[in-house]
């Protein structure tokens, strides 16, 4: 019994003066609390607590369930205790079948003994199954058996308390351990689509998937910069004991333009939080925006290839696409495809492949596209660069020499005089008149240039060269002169070409 120095309040004394007492079932329990300031006796075992205001606690016929701790308390709040075992061969264990374990913590299997003198007090698996190899436990006859550091793997483990009584193994009623998992990571959240584009009045529905070790994970859809509670519907599944999945579906049945914004799916557990967002854009009607991938004015050399490429955004999806030239629709030579295979893709590519273009194939090429809401088009002006071609090379009645050349870009005509039989004509002759003949004619075709010089300027035998050139190449035509007396006579007009020139003859 406790002892204290005189003058200080002391704890009560209990008779019998023992810390433990063993009573046979059916016998009397008689406990006396000696204290001038006696207040009460309390009895505790498992789920039961009882009080008695009499200083003598008497149980005439003790039962196994009277096993437990008897505590006497005085008016100073000081107490003393005695533990009573009521030995009952028919009831070796008192049990409270509720058994919860928190992962990584210890838990108590509450199966105190009614007889402290039994041996091999331990845990056993149900139906003779072995306990997990790593399960460690510590027995205490008055409290039960503590399982150390509970693991997730012990969830739903069926066990018995066990002890040897007079050489025989006795089992308690079964316990089923329910393990509550520790959150060791944030929830895993994902969203059905990262962005949505809708027209007014269409339904917006987005699903967030939340995965965690238990259903106690918290989740919600939130609108960014708004406190309004959103309407959600849930579906959930357990894929095994510690693999929980929830689908939270947010729906706006008739979306409006002002519903546009960022929506966040937020989830948290005791470890931390995670979130994922989706963007909603609501437009009042559909649209098509076309972006040329090359300049809309295209210059291409005669005989070469060119690809006219556009990218375009279309919502809703495009229904009709076509390429047109001179009021004729291309049936082939073009392809149209989505920019990505992504479900939310609204960007597309259209390519028209023009091959071995001729000078006559310049002009306006138009791409047209439409969806259920709008039409859109874009035009490309294609110019075919051609080397000059000398169309005519004549001596006119009025003594003029005339050279007419066609090409694109507009050719430049230069004149040269070569005295005698020299091959190289270097002395340039200024033209009297230069005209662009079809400047007001149809666009995109070859440009025709006419240049004239006065032949009376030539006093000696020789050759006149008309040289037409542009960025693509050059062509020359020659006119030979011989003098007979005072008369100047055209002997042999003809064209000669450099290897890069196109053949053209006049006689």
């Amino acid at each position: 019994q406790p002892s204290v120095s005189p003058g200080e309040p002391s704890p009560p004394s209990i008779h019998p003066a023992k810390s433990e007492l063993i009573v046979r079932v059916g016998n009397e329990i008689r406990l006396l609390c000696i204290d001038p300031g006696f207040v009460k006796w309390t009895f505790e075992i498992l789920d039961e607590t009882n009080e008695n205001k009499q200083n003598e606690w008497i149980t005439e016929k003790a039962e196994a369930t009277n096993t437990g701790k008897y505590t006497c308390t005085n008016k100073h709040g000081l107490s003393s205790s005695i533990y009573v075992f009521v030995r009952d061969p028919a009831k070796l264990f008192l049990v409270d079948r509720s058994l919860y374990g928190k992962e990584d913590n210890d838990t108590l299997v509450r199966c105190p003994l009614t007889d402290p003198e039994v041996t091999s007090y331990s845990l056993k698996g149900c139906q003779g199954k072995p306990l997990p190899k790593d399960l460690r436990f510590v027995p205490d006859p008055k409290a039960g058996i503590t399982i150390k550091s509970v693991k997730r793997a012990y969830h739903r483990l069926c066990l018995h308390c066990s002890a040897d009584q007079e050489g025989k193994s006795v089992l308690s009623d079964k316990f089923i351990l329910k393990v509550r998992p520790a959150f060791k990571a944030v929830p895993v959240v994902s969203v059905s689509k990262a962005s949505y584009l809708l027209r007014e009045g269409e339904e917006f529905t987005v699903t967030c998937t939340i995965k965690d070790v238990s259903s106690s994970v918290y989740s919600t859809w939130k609108r960014e910069n708004s406190q309004t509670k959103l309407q959600e519907k849930y579906n959930s599944w357990h894929h095994g004991d510690f693999n929980y999945e929830r689908q939270a579906t947010l729906t706006i049945s008739s979306a409006r333009v002002n519903d546009s914004g960022v929506f966040m799916c937020y989830a948290n557990n005791t470890f931390g939080s995670a979130n994922v967002t989706t963007t909603l854009e609501v437009v009042d009607k559909g649209f098509i925006n076309i972006f040329p991938m090359i300049n809309t004015t295209v210059f291409v050399n005669d005989g070469e290839n060119v690809d006219l490429i556009v990218e375009y955004e279309a919502f809703p999806k495009p229904e009709h696409q076509q390429w047109i030239y001179m009021n004729r629709t291309f049936t082939d030579k073009w392809e149209d495809y989505p920019k990505s295979e992504n479900e939310s893709n609204i960007r597309y590519v259209s390519e028209l492949h023009l091959t071995r273009l001729k000078g006559t194939e310049g002009g306006t090429y138009t791409f047209l596209v439409s969806n259920s809401d709008v039409n859109a088009s874009i035009a490309f002006n294609v110019y075919v660069n051609t080397k000059p071609e000398i169309l005519t090379y004549d001596r006119l009645v009025n003594g003029m020499l005339q050279c007419v050349a066609a090409g694109f870009p507009e050719p430049t005509i230069d004149w040269y005089f070569c005295p005698g039989t020299e091959q190289r004509c270097s002395a340039s002759v200024l033209p009297v008149d230069v005209q662009t003949l079809n400047a007001s004619g149809p666009p995109f075709g070859k440009l025709v240039v006419q240049s004239s010089i006065d032949s009376s300027a030539f006093k000696h035998n020789g050759t006149v060269e008309c040289k037409a050139y542009n960025d693509v190449g050059k062509t020359s035509a020659y006119f030979n002169f011989a003098f007979k007396g005072n008369n100047k006579e055209q002997i042999h007009p003809h064209t000669l070409f450099t290897p890069r020139s196109h053949h053209h003859h006049h006689h």
Partner: antibody, heavy 116, light 107 residues
């Protein structure tokens, strides 16, 4: 013998909150779980959530998450259930019950009426 | 969440009758099933836990059986005090869910 005694009936306005208490006696409070189960008039039973006081954390049914808070005060052996943003369909008898899985002891119930 | 379906929703019987109520789970719940009795204006009372274990203090005329998805509560000989609503409840996974109830009435 274990007893669970709940606080009295409440009448609340929509949008407000209610906090119901459940005092346990005759048993060890902290080592047991305590759940809250509600029953709307003429309807069945619906588990809202539960707490194991010694673990300190609560489990909630998704339907009530964000709106219900379950707490426990070990010093007074009392559990509490607070339900916020009340609506008319929250009118029900709210029971506390011992356990997180099956429920061996029940409180007498607390009628919460939500009415404007 | 796991759905629990009870049948019948109500039944009429006489004192002394053998009464059987069934409960079906939407997925395997092993033996994590309890049965409760509720009388008007009272809290439910646990009768059976772990599908077939009789709760302390409950008369032996009540028994439970089943495993997996199909479960049965049997009252071997109906007594006047047994007229009540009976609920099944699964607790294999949280959230725990209840059946819609079976009302046992006097014929």
């Amino acid at each position: 013998q274990v007893q669970l005694v709940q606080s009295g009936a409440e009448v609340k306005k929509p949008g407000s909150s209610v906090k119901v208490s459940c005092k346990a006696s005759g048993g060890t409070f902290s080592s047991h779980a305590l759940s809250w189960v509600r029953q709307a008039p003429g309807q069945g039973l619906e588990w809202m959530g539960g707490i194991i006081p010694s673990f300190g954390t609560a489990d909630y049914a998704q339907k009530f998450q964000g709106r219900v808070t379950i707490t426990a005060d070990e010093s007074t052996s009392t559990a509490y259930m607070e339900l916020s943003s009340l609506r008319s369909e929250d009118t029900a008898v709210y029971y506390c019950a011992r356990g997180l899985y099956d429920f061996d002891y029940w409180g007498q119930g607390t009628l919460v009426t939500v009415s404007s | 969440d796991i759905q629990m379906t009870q049948s019948p929703s109500s039944l009429s019987a006489s004192v002394g009758d053998r009464v059987t109520i069934t409960c079906r789970a939407s997925q395997d719940i092993s033996q994590d099933l309890a049965w409760y009795q509720q009388k008007p204006g009272k809290a439910p009372k646990l009768l059976i836990y772990d599908a077939s274990s009789l709760q302390s203090g409950v008369p032996s005329r009540f028994s439970g059986s089943g495993s997996g998805t199909d479960f049965t509560l049997t009252i071997s000989s109906l007594q006047p005090e047994d007229f009540a609503v009976y609920y099944c409840q699964q607790y294999y996974y949280l959230p725990s869910t209840f059946g819609q109830g079976t009302k046992v009435e006097i014929k």
